[in-house]
């Protein structure tokens, strides 16, 4: 990656790390307005199975693992990227390593959900306060989940699907910060581990994933008012361990694994037309990326 100053542009889709033959240290950013990719400062340690989020204009890379020819190390790391300086800096680590983690942000706090350390599949959840650089455990989920999709809607944290160490899951649960408790919600129509989960227009979307037999291209969304999951148009590619984010009212899915190939494909969903379109390709195929969008 480049070490010069990053151009000062608007909202970019950042993709960090990932896996292709080994864990990757790439940080790249896609500008949907002109279709260009920027090559930015590498992560200090390669990692896949990480999650990305943005708080206060800073990009955070959370958890994952470094799967390299020299070994395989699950990560408890939290690293912070400043787009203005194009530099990474380490923050306080989590209490445990969390590979295939999910993260969400409520009120400027980062919630790290599930993930694995070796063969241990976590149900634990911890919250990071950037202003104090501290992590604190909160109530554990009702279910152990790795490859969990996490999204925040109306200041509630949703954990969707994943793998509990024995079974891939269609179950989902919701965390209430004020009560510090989790409650199950309606299960998805489809078992999904390693799905992309995000929020768009008051609905939680779950895209792709792996059902224990095959990668999926199906997509469903949860309406919090009716408490029901409904299928929408499928993606063009089956994919698990994909990256997902929302940019200007559209969902973007990045990369993933289709059972044969590490995808470079980036698809975009338009909810107005219920259609997916291929919008760009990443510079190389990869799965297990962390994705987030810079704030305005």
């Amino acid at each position: 990656g480049s070490m010069g100053h990053a151009p000062k542009v608007g909202r970019l889709i950042y993709t960090a790390g990932g896996y292709f033959r080994q864990s990757l240290s790439y940080l790249e950013a896609y500008n949907p307005s002109d279709g260009t990719w920027l090559d930015l400062a590498d992560l200090q340690v390669p990692r896949s199975g990480l999650a990305g989020c943005v708080v206060g204009g800073l990009l955070y890379a959370v958890g994952g693992r470094n799967n390299s020819p020299d070994g395989n190390t699950d990560s408890s790391a939290l690293d912070c990227y400043n787009p203005m300086t194009n530099q990474w800096s380490p923050c306080a680590p989590m209490s445990v390593p969390r590979n295939r983690i999910g993260v969400g942000v409520i009120d400027g706090h980062i919630y790290a959900v599930g993930g694995s350390h070796g063969c241990i599949h976590h149900n634990s959840v911890e919250r990071y306060e950037p202003e104090r650089d501290e992590w604190h455990l909160v109530a554990p989920m009702l279910t152990r989940r790795i490859g969990v999709g996490v999204a925040v809607l109306n200041r509630l944290l949703y954990a969707v699907g994943g793998f509990d160490g024995t079974n891939r899951l269609n179950s989902a649960e919701c965390y209430y910060p004020e009560r510090n408790e989790w409650r199950m919600i309606t299960a998805m129509n489809t078992i999904r581990s390693g799905a992309g989960v995000c929020v768009l227009h008051n609905c939680i979307y779950a895209a792709g994933g792996y059902d224990g037999q095959d990668q999926l291209n199906s997509v469903e969304r949860y309406d919090v008012e009716t408490e029901t999951w409904t299928f929408v148009a499928p993606m063009k590619h089956r994919r698990s361990a994909l990256g997902i984010t929302v940019h200007q009212g559209r969902i973007y899915v990045l990369g993933g694994y289709d059972g044969h190939t590490f995808l470079d494909s980036v698809e975009c969903y338009d909810p107005d037309t219920d259609t997916w379109s291929e919008v760009t390709r990443m510079t190389s195929g990869r799965s297990g990326v962390g994705v987030a969008v810079t704030m305005e």
């Epitope: 896996y19 033959r21 199975g49 070796g118 793998f163 224990g212 037999q213 095959d214 694994y257």
Partner: antibody, heavy 117, light 107 residues
Framework: EVQLVESGGGLVQPGGSLRLSCAAS????????IHWVRQAPGKGLEWVAS????????LYAKSVAGRFTISADTSKNTAYLQMNSLRAEDTAVYYC??????????WGQGTLVTVSS | DIQMTQSPSSLSASVGDRVTITCRAS??????VAWYQQKPGKAPKLLIY???SLYSGVPSRFSGSRSGTDFTLTISSLQPEDFATYYC?????????FGQGTKVEIK
């Protein structure tokens, strides 16, 4: 009936290459982690490599990392182990096996790889 | 790497005997331990997974237990077909490692 059948073993000179195949029947390899385990003559078992069906991530023993590559072709329901830069100490029976919880439940009959000049 | 130290390396026993084989992990491996039986010229067969779960089709005379980092395979009443080599394996952390094996021979 679940079956794993290895092939591709044989005699190869040091520095040479071989590609082992593991044909699965009775289950889809897309539904399980597939592992290769080897056993040198008169010795114990040594885990070699694995591939995760969900993420595509692969893991390797340090003794083979950078030389061996595990892969899977779900359309053929077959897993592979590409072995390059072979050494005398790679001589072993190579088994393909399927993960089950914290164990390996189905094993092939094994294929012998002999590295010798 | 986690070492799995198996003992004894060999033992002699008679049909009907109770046989115990132990594996000690060099660090915590939770319950991520399996036991296998292997006969000469054959592939290993899974007996026990997750430290104490009996694999489908395996006779109930085989059992597994855990105490901390010590894992035990017990054959309650040895049968003629049980004379073989037994291996433990941990899959708690990368890389997965096996014990060196215990050969059970006829006394």
């Amino acid at each position: 009936e679940v079956q794993l059948v290895e092939s591709g073993g044989g005699l190869v000179q040091p520095g040479g290459s071989l590609r082992l195949s593991c044909a699965a029947s009775g289950f889809a390899i897309s539904a399980s982690s597939i592992h290769w385990v080897r056993q040198a003559p008169g010795k114990g078992l040594e885990w070699v490599a694995s591939i995760d069906p969900e993420t595509g991530e692969t893991l390797y023993a340090k003794s083979v990392a950078g030389r061996f590559t595990i892969s899977a072709d779900t359309s053929k329901n077959t897993a592979y182990l590409q072995m390059n830069s072979l050494r005398a100490e790679d001589t072993a029976v190579y088994y393909c096996t399927r993960a089950h919880a914290y164990g390996l439940d189905y094993w092939g009959q094994g294929t012998l790889v002999t590295v010798s000049s | 790497d986690i070492q799995m130290t198996q003992s004894p390396s060999s033992l002699s026993a008679s049909v009907g005997d109770r046989v115990t084989i132990t594996c000690r992990a060099s660090q915590s491996v939770s319950s991520a331990v399996a036991w296998y039986q292997q006969k000469p010229g054959k592939a290993p067969k899974l007996l026990i997974y997750s430290a104490s779960s009996l694999y489908s089709g395996v006779p109930s005379r085989f059992s597994g237990s855990r105490s901390g980092t010590d894992f035990t395979l017990t054959i309650s009443s040895l049968q003629p077909e049980d004379f073989a080599t037994y291996y433990c394996q941990q899959s708690y952390s990368f890389p997965s490692t096996f014990g060196q094996g215990t050969k059970v021979e006829i006394k």
